[in-house]
């Protein structure tokens, strides 16, 4: 069927439209276009005779129309009056006629709109504002944008007049925004410049800063007032009801107690005609005294006594502050503050609670600090230590032992040999010792203030012969490539040389081996399974030498990547499958099998009798070492062929 398609359907003024003909019959004599929905000679636009390829204009021709050989009609430089229907009249060679009608609509290219307003300075919570989008255009859609976003949903926003007018009821300061309108029709869209709504508001209740109301005599009083307002507010100050000045700030230098009173800030908005006031009460104090700290216990005993520190003097309506070691109080269950913060209690004092302690009195703008106080905490004595640490001496040398125990006041020391008091000194000196000087040497430390005593006993051996040494280790089961091991040769002896052997040979040169502590300690870094050897230490002096029993290092390692044997992967149907898995590991690993991902048995050997092609698949051996926490696995593919068709070797039972 003959049809007309308009391209485009909606046309902008000044542009072109093509009335495209579809399903044009064959064997045509010619055709003619008419304005309107019917054939009317007075409204003929143009005709076309196919034989002569000649176009002929009609009464409705405007000079803007062009007809094509395929009967399509182009109209250029479109005007508003072109809107409507167009009829194509087709004359066939047999002089039978056919008609089709098409249509299009013409729209103007829209001008840039602008916004008019009925109120340029609306007052908050009082006025309404109506914005109108100009000009009024037929067949145009109107849209509104606030801060480049579509209109928010609000009961105070109302669109009217075909959306051409936007009304804001009861404007607020938050309506101060950029407003734009947009006009749209099917062929164009234009947006206006933005209009900023200037809402008059305020003043709100003013705020006076700073907030503090207490001052010391001699300070400067500097108050500032601010109230949200458009246009900005005008400010006035009143002291005890008497007008002072019309400024935003009030400054009074070198105030006295007489400046105490009520200070009022008044904010005024000349456009809204509104006034708001805020009152603050200022109190001026005379200079307070410097605080000081008193204590209920000047010599508390560690872990026994509590101490209460009090900040003096007591002043009503005053904030008390505390500092320990020049820092604010740490959070601790042993520190307690009284309700007024004036007393700080230390429960069960320790030697670390010595301080210094400071308290302060806060006076609004500043803080007065006390002098620091240091606590004399009595503690100790702790277990004394005897030095040097040697236990073996050769005859003929001098024995010089020193004793020390942490204590306050400092400890008093006594020495005993085999339980017999020797002397009341910190050091014990015996010259030219012999075997008879061997025995138990006791140091006793006493704190006279706390009455506590502590002792330490040391065995001293005087002998020309060195004792048989022994090896101590800091790690009896190190993990390979992870741990280090430190061997120490015992005992510690004076003027003694320490030696080491590994598997009966002197130490190899290795960056992983390190001697320290006068060669008394041998450290193996990043141990490996090859370090699992016999270690012997020896001690020697100018008189004698001795060796320890060997110590064998038990290095935990693995599991390494397992090996499945036999290596064959092809089997004949009916054979027995006997796979064995092995992985180097210390201690021995746990084994488990999976066939095609399905767990089997937890054994080292996997046995399947009389296999068939159903036993084809992947055979995985999993190993795990519980001591090292490490795992490993290997996968092997097994192919079972029907008897006589095996591509490879067969493995029997």
């Amino acid at each position: 069927k003959l049809t007309i398609e308009s391209t485009p359907f909606n046309v902008a003024e000044g542009k072109e439209v093509l009335l495209l003909v579809h399903n044009l019959p064959q064997h045509l004599f010619g055709y003619s276009w008419y304005k309107g929905e019917r054939v009317d000679g007075n409204r003929q636009i143009i005709g076309y005779v196919i034989g002569t390829q000649q176009a002929t204009p009609g009464p409705a021709y405007s000079g803007r129309e062009i007809i094509y050989p395929n009967a399509s009609l182009l109209i250029q430089n479109i005007i508003q009056n072109d809107t409507g229907f167009y009829t194509l009249h087709v004359i066939k060679s047999d002089l039978v006629n056919e008609e089709a009608t098409g249509q299009f609509r013409v729209y103007p290219e829209l001008p840039k709109p602008s916004i008019s307003s009925n109120n340029s300075k609306p007052v908050e919570d009082k006025d309404a504002v109506a914005f109108t989008c100009e000009p009024e255009t037929q067949d145009a859609t109107y849209l509104w944008w606030v801060n480049n976003q579509s209109l928010p949903v609000s009961p105070r926003l109302q669109l009217s007049n075909g959306n051409r007018t936007l009304t804001l009821f009861n404007v607020t300061r938050n309506d101060t925004a950029s407003y734009k309108c947009e006009t749209q029709n099917p062929v164009s869209a234009r947006r206006s410049d933005s209009v900023i709504l200037n809402v008059l508001y305020g003043p709100d209740a003013p705020t006076i800063s700073p907030l503090n109301t207490s001052y010391r005599s001699g300070e400067n009083l500097n108050l500032s007032c601010h109230a949200a307002s458009n246009p900005p507010a005008q400010y006035s100050w009143f002291v005890n009801g008497t007008f002072q000045q019309s400024t935003q700030e009030l400054f009074i230098p070198n105030i006295t107690v007489n400046n105490s009173g009520s200070y009022t800030c008044q904010a005024h908005n000349s456009d809204t005609g509104l006034n708001r006031t805020t009152v603050t009460t200022i109190t001026v104090y005379a200079e307070p005294p410097k605080p000081f700290i008193t204590s209920n216990n000047s010599n508390p005993v560690e872990d026994e006594d509590a101490v209460a520190l009090t900040c003096e003097p007591e002043i009503q309506n005053t904030t008390y502050l505390w500092w320990v070691n020049n820092q604010s109080l740490p959070v601790s269950p042993r520190l307690q503050l009284s309700n007024d913060n004036r007393t700080l209690t230390l429960l069960s004092v320790t030697r670390n609670d010595v301080g210094p302690y400071e308290c302060g009195i806060q006076n609004e703008l500043s803080v007065d600090h006390s002098d620091p106080v240091i606590l004399n905490v009595l503690y100790g004595p702790d277990d004394p230590t005897i030095s040097p640490s040697y236990t073996y001496y050769r005859p003929g040398v001098n024995l010089s032992l020193s004793c020390h125990a942490a204590s306050n006041p400092p400890a008093q020391y006594s020495w005993l040999i085999d339980g017999n008091i020797q002397q009341h000194t910190q050091e014990l000196f015996i010259s030219n010792i012999t075997e008879k000087n061997s025995g138990l040497y006791t140091c006793q430390a006493n704190n006279s203030a706390s009455g506590h005593s502590r002792t330490t006993v040391k065995t001293i051996t005087v002998s020309a012969e060195l004792p048989k040494p022994s090896i101590s280790s800091n790690n009896s089961k190190p993990v390979e490539d992870k741990d280090a091991v430190a061997f120490t040769c015992e005992p510690e002896a004076q003027n003694t040389t320490y030696l080491w052997w590994v598997n009966g040979q002197s130490l190899p040169v290795s960056p992983r081996l390190q001697l320290s502590n006068g060669n008394r300690t041998l450290t193996l870094f990043n141990v490996t399974r090859n370090d699992a050897r016999a270690y012997v230490c020896g001690i020697q002096n100018s008189v004698s030498a001795n060796r320890s029993d060997p110590v064998t290092l038990d290095v935990l390692y693995g599991p390494d990547t397992p090996i499945i044997s036999p290596p064959d992967s092809s089997y004949l149907s009916g054979a027995n499958l006997n796979l064995s898995c092995h992985s180097a590991s210390n201690p021995s690993p746990q084994y488990s099998w999976r066939i095609n991902g399905i767990p089997q048995q937890h054994t080292q050997v996997l046995f399947i009798a009389k296999i068939t092609p159903n036993n084809n698949g992947t055979y995985a051996c999993f190993v795990s070492n519980l001591a090292t926490g490490r795992n490993n696995s290997i996968v092997k593919s097994i192919t079972v062929s029907a008897s006589g068709t095996s591509p490879g070797l067969s493995a029997g039972a």
């Epitope: 072109e16 093509l18 021709y61 405007s62 000079g63 803007r64 062009i66 182009l74 250029q76 430089n77």
Partner: nanobody, 119 residues
Framework: EVQLVESGGGLVQPGGSLRLSCAAS????????IGWVRRAPGKEEELVAA????????RYADSVKGRFTISADTSKNTAYLQMNSLRAEDTAVYYC????????????WGQGTTVTVSS
């Protein structure tokens, strides 16, 4: 009545000049595009120049660029084709046409005017 009437043709020597006129009636040339089309025996029909007065644009065939100038006088509703440096190959019947700059097509129905370039 809608009409396009061409005039100004004639015999001219090579290198000479002619000015063709196209008088339109029944519509305003300021609303549309006017083109000059030439037909010569044994040659393909050729659009040589066109002017869209409402757009203020002109176009020329490569063969006449720099030699021919198209213009329009909207007060007289007439279009003109000034032809300079004429060559023998410019010999043809010149028709005034309604031209579509958009689809590069035209309709014409005037009688045409003959231009002969010969020594």
């Amino acid at each position: 009545e809608v009409q396009l009437v061409e005039s100004g043709g004639g015999l001219v020597q090579p290198g000479g000049s002619l000015r063709l006129s196209c008088a339109a009636s029944g519509f305003n040339i300021k609303d549309t595009c006017i083109g000059w089309v030439r037909r010569a025996p044994g040659k393909e029909e050729e659009l040589v120049a066109a002017i869209c007065t409402y757009k203020g644009t002109t176009r020329y065939a490569d063969s006449v660029k720099g030699r021919f100038t198209i213009s329009a006088d909207t007060s007289k509703n007439t279009a003109y084709l000034q032809m300079n440096s004429l060559r023998a190959e410019d010999t043809a019947v010149y028709y005034c046409a309604i031209y579509s700059h958009y689809y590069d097509y035209y309709n014409y129905w005037g009688q045409g005017t003959t231009v002969t370039v010969s020594s």
